[in-house]
């Protein structure tokens, strides 16, 4: 299929800058609520992250015909273009931060798709040709993933959740309460 | 200024013991976890051990399991590794490190300190 | 032997643009973060690039990383003579529980 793009928007999906989301209740832990869940307080000592919109799952929205050969779509369709990163841990959500944040390196996330929409569209062909009916599948919505094997950096397909896996049989420790208001957005967003 | 500082290197006996310090100033000590990382003469870097910021999450590189272990004290600013049974394979530099971002490397070393384990 | 592979050995001249190839396995590139170090002679190694393709502050932006299944690679360009030192990539290895460093690359600036 060829397509040919004539606008795009864009939508980010990211936690706030040193907000973090609320610890399930049952891994709260007095000792700590008052730290940042994944290795420090919020950004203030000499090695800040860098500015947060370097470091989120972006929805860029296209809208593009479909072509088929000589036809093209009567009308556009809107699809979304995952792009950006999921990184440092220190802007990702308890969701996918199961593993151990304060060590050096650890579980890779990738902004890919998460949802498809499949949508039927007719396509115009010249030379008084029937009009075709075609179904195109579209990417629904973006979410951040776990790299595994399988996944290539260039390479952002349908790939399959994996959840990070606990090290060590440990539970993960709970390092901060944040603000409640960011929770829903969150979990939805990851 | 950041500065990690390490001490208690030396020349040592294989099977004895030696205690490596490391001395944290320029930061706020508990933001960082903290980690031990050695070169060998002429080769190149090897993690030891690592440990989190309260001190109560511990890993430990397979050739010193059970023969080191790594503990802080954040009221002193202070990173230790107690290497009991020392080999001479462990002659190396042993620099202190840390890290501020969760799985964002480590940004900030010592100059390290220097164990020779010889006979 | 290194868990992670790097060549021993990189040169090129000032100005030109190296890369430094880095290969793992399933357990620490193809599912971890990768960063890298940079260690001039007879001093302490220094972050360079940390989570595949980030710059600390303070790093040129001539250094870049990037990563792709299990192996990562470290692009220098406009090398200067400054740029010689030995450099190291490293990743958490999910099956040795440890935090791996590759052998190191010495590069030599012509």
């Known amino acids: 299929q060829g397509w040919q793009a004539f606008k795009n928007d864009a939508t980010e999906i990211i936690p706030e800058l040193g907000e973090y989301p609320e610890p399930p209740p049952e891994l709260e832990n007095n000792k700590t609520m008052n730290r940042a869940e994944n290795g420090g307080r919020p950004p203030h000592h000499p090695f800040e992250t860098k500015d947060v919109s370097e470091y989120s799952c972006r929805e860029l929205h296209f809208t593009r015909y479909v072509t088929d050969g000589p036809c093209r779509s009567a009308k556009p369709v809107t699809e979304l273009v995952c792009s950006g990163q999921c990184g440092p841990a220190r802007l990702l959500p308890n969701a996918i931060g199961r593993g151990k944040w304060w060590r050096p390196s650890g579980p890779d996330f990738r902004c890919i798709p998460d949802r498809y929409r499949a949508q039927r569209v007719q396509l115009l062909c010249p030379g008084g040709e029937a009009p075709r009916a075609r179904k195109v599948r579209l990417v629904a919505s973006c979410k951040c993933k776990r790299l595994t094997r399988f996944h290539n950096q260039s390479e952002l397909k349908d790939f399959g959740t994996e959840a990070a896996r606990p090290q060590k049989g440990r539970k993960p420790r709970p390092r901060a309460r944040s603000a409640k208001a960011n929770q829903a957005e969150l979990e939805n967003a990851y | 200024e950041v500065q990690l500082v390490e001490s208690g290197g030396g020349l040592v006996q294989p099977g004895r013991s030696l205690r490596l310090s490391c001395a944290a100033s320029?930061?706020?000590?508990?933001?960082?976890?903290l980690h031990w990382v050695r070169q060998a003469p002429g080769k190149g870097l090897e993690w030891v051990s690592g440990?989190?910021?309260?001190?109560?999450?511990?890993d430990y590189a397979d050739s010193v399991k059970g023969r080191f272990t790594i503990s802080r004290d954040n009221a002193k600013n202070s990173l230790y590794l107690q290497m009991n049974s020392l080999r001479v394979e462990d002659t190396a530099l042993y620099y202190c490190?840390?890290?501020?971002?969760?799985?964002?490397?480590?940004?900030?070393w010592g100059q390290g300190t220097t164990v020779t384990v010889s006979s | 032997q290194s868990v992670l592979t790097q060549p021993p050995s990189a040169s090129g001249t000032p100005g030109q643009r190296v890369t430094i190839s880095c290969s793992g396995s399933?357990?620490?590139?193809?599912?971890?973060?990768v960063n890298w170090y940079q260690q001039l002679p007879g001093t302490a190694p220094k972050l360079l690039i940390y989570?595949?393709?980030q710059r600390p502050s303070g790093v040129p932006d001539r250094f870049s990383g990037s990563k792709s299944g299990t192996s990562a690679s470290l692009a220098i360009s406009g090398l200067q003579s400054e740029d010689e030192a030995d450099y190291y990539c490293?990743?958490?290895?999910?099956?040795?529980?440890?935090?791996?460093f590759g052998g190191g690359t010495k590069l030599t600036v012509l």
């Open positions: 490190a840390g890290n501020s971002r969760g799985y964002g490397g480590l940004d900030v």
């Open positions: 320029g930061f706020t000590f508990d933001d960082y976890a």
């Open positions: 440990i989190n910021w309260e001190g109560d999450d511990i």
């Open positions: 399933s357990s620490n590139i193809g599912r971890n973060t």
């Open positions: 989570s595949n393709n």
């Open positions: 490293a990743a958490w290895d999910d099956n040795l529980e440890s935090y791996v």
